[in-house]
């Protein structure tokens, strides 16, 4: 595609190239043959993040505590507010418009990856030799107790939900 009639950071209006408003400012009036583009800074709690010809600035996002949200990064005239979730909660979408409680890993499953403000807990089934007997958002699968290192023997086999039960070795009479 060939370049357009107006350069970067310009726009075409009524047969002339006018300067776009810089980020953080909105358009008040287009340029004319005799005047420059007129721009005004965005107000408090407003922003525009690109070179633009918008006549209204966008409102900063509101991090609603009733939805479990809090401010991660305060907005400026050039950037929107970034929300994240309260401790123990995570965003339901990339836009982080609401939060849900972190999921817990059921018995038989351990935490593979602890949840963050933007991602849920990732669980994995406990493999042979490991168990989890609690519902938790933090606990990994624990290895079965090694009876041998305690000079004990396995009295009850472990499962993915229970540890092995160790007991004393039978004495030879």
């Amino acid at each position: 595609e060939p370049p357009t009639a107006c350069r970067e950071k310009q726009y075409l209006i009524n047969s002339q190239c006018c300067s776009l408003c810089q980020p953080g400012q909105k358009l008040v009036s287009d340029c004319t043959e005799f005047t420059e583009t007129e721009c005004l800074p965005c107000g408090e709690s407003e922003f525009l993040d690109t070179w633009n010809r918008e006549t209204h600035c966008h409102q900063h996002k509101y991090c609603d505590p009733n939805l479990g949200l809090r401010v991660q990064q305060k907005g400026t005239s050039e950037t929107d507010t970034i929300c994240t979730c309260e401790e123990g909660w995570h965003c339901t979408s990339e836009a982080c418009e609401s939060c849900v409680l972190h999921r817990s890993c059921s018995p038989g499953f351990g935490v593979k990856q602890i949840a963050t403000g933007v991602s849920d807990t990732i669980c994995e089934p406990c493999p042979v030799g490991f168990f989890s007997n609690v519902s938790s958002a933090f606990e990994k699968c624990h290895p079965w107790t090694s009876c041998e290192t305690k000079d004990l023997v396995v009295q009850q086999a472990g499962t993915n939900k229970t540890d092995v039960v160790c007991g004393p070795q039978d004495r030879l009479r």
Epitope: P2, A5, R7, N14, S15, Q16
Partner: antibody, heavy 116, light 107 residues
């Protein structure tokens, strides 16, 4: 004073191409856009495209895309409009105009007749 | 594209009378509306740009008004040299588009 002087009338056969020139004087050629418009006999005005003579950037009416080419030669303050694959309904007066706030100054027009 | 509709198609007026020409856009054009005069054998002339700005050298009897989608060209007292065809044109959104014209003729 601002003047736009266009090349003379042309008669072309269907399928041929035509190149109309527009020589500007009386202002800084690279400071204003050049617009191209046509008017078929007894009809209204139809916008073809616009060129920035400063660096050759263009915008075309979708209707003419692929058939029209706008160019400019800064050294002689002249803009050109070339229309290819001519059809009988391209018969019209072709105008160049200097931009500003609107089409501020117009050329006298160039009659292009397409006939077999 | 934005469709420009002019009315009336022909306006018959006596010299010295007032003439009012209308132009309607199919959507809001934010005052980017220009008026042109065309006479046989002469170059097209810009009369008014951006709704109401009189172009250099144009007599003050020509004036423009309007907003949104409705615009008006007024010639307060018609002179003999004002009998011509008048076109409106929007400069808000590509492709630029023109009205079909209003012919102002002697009554």
């Amino acid at each position: 004073q601002v003047q736009l002087v266009q090349s003379g009338a042309e008669v072309k056969k269907p399928g041929a191409s035509v190149k109309v020139s527009c020589k500007a004087s009386g202002y800084g050629f690279t400071n204003y856009l050049i617009e191209w418009v046509r008017q078929a006999p007894g009809q209204g005005l139809e916008w073809i495209g616009v060129i920035n003579p400063g660096y050759g950037g263009v915008n075309y009416n979708e209707k003419f895309k692929g058939r029209v080419t706008l160019t400019a030669d800064k050294s002689i303050s002249t803009a050109y409009m070339e229309l290819s694959r001519l059809r009988s309904d391209d018969t019209a007066v072709y105008f160049c105009a200097r931009g500003g706030s609107g089409f501020a100054f117009w050329g006298q027009g160039t009659l292009v007749t397409v006939s077999s | 594209e934005i469709v420009m509709t002019q009315s009336p198609a022909t306006l018959s007026v006596s010299p010295g009378e007032r003439a009012t020409l209308s132009c309607r856009a199919s959507q809001d054009i934010s005052n980017h509306l220009n008026w042109y005069q065309q006479k046989p054998g002469q170059a097209v002339r810009l009369l008014i740009s951006s709704t109401s700005r009189l172009h250099s050298g144009i007599p003050a009897r020509f004036s423009g008004s309007g907003s949104g989608t409705e615009y008006t060209l007024t010639i307060s007292s018609l002179q003999s040299e004002d009998f011509a065809v008048y076109f409106c044109q929007q400069g808000n959104t590509l492709p630029w588009t023109f009205g079909q014209g209003t012919k102002v003729e002697i009554k």
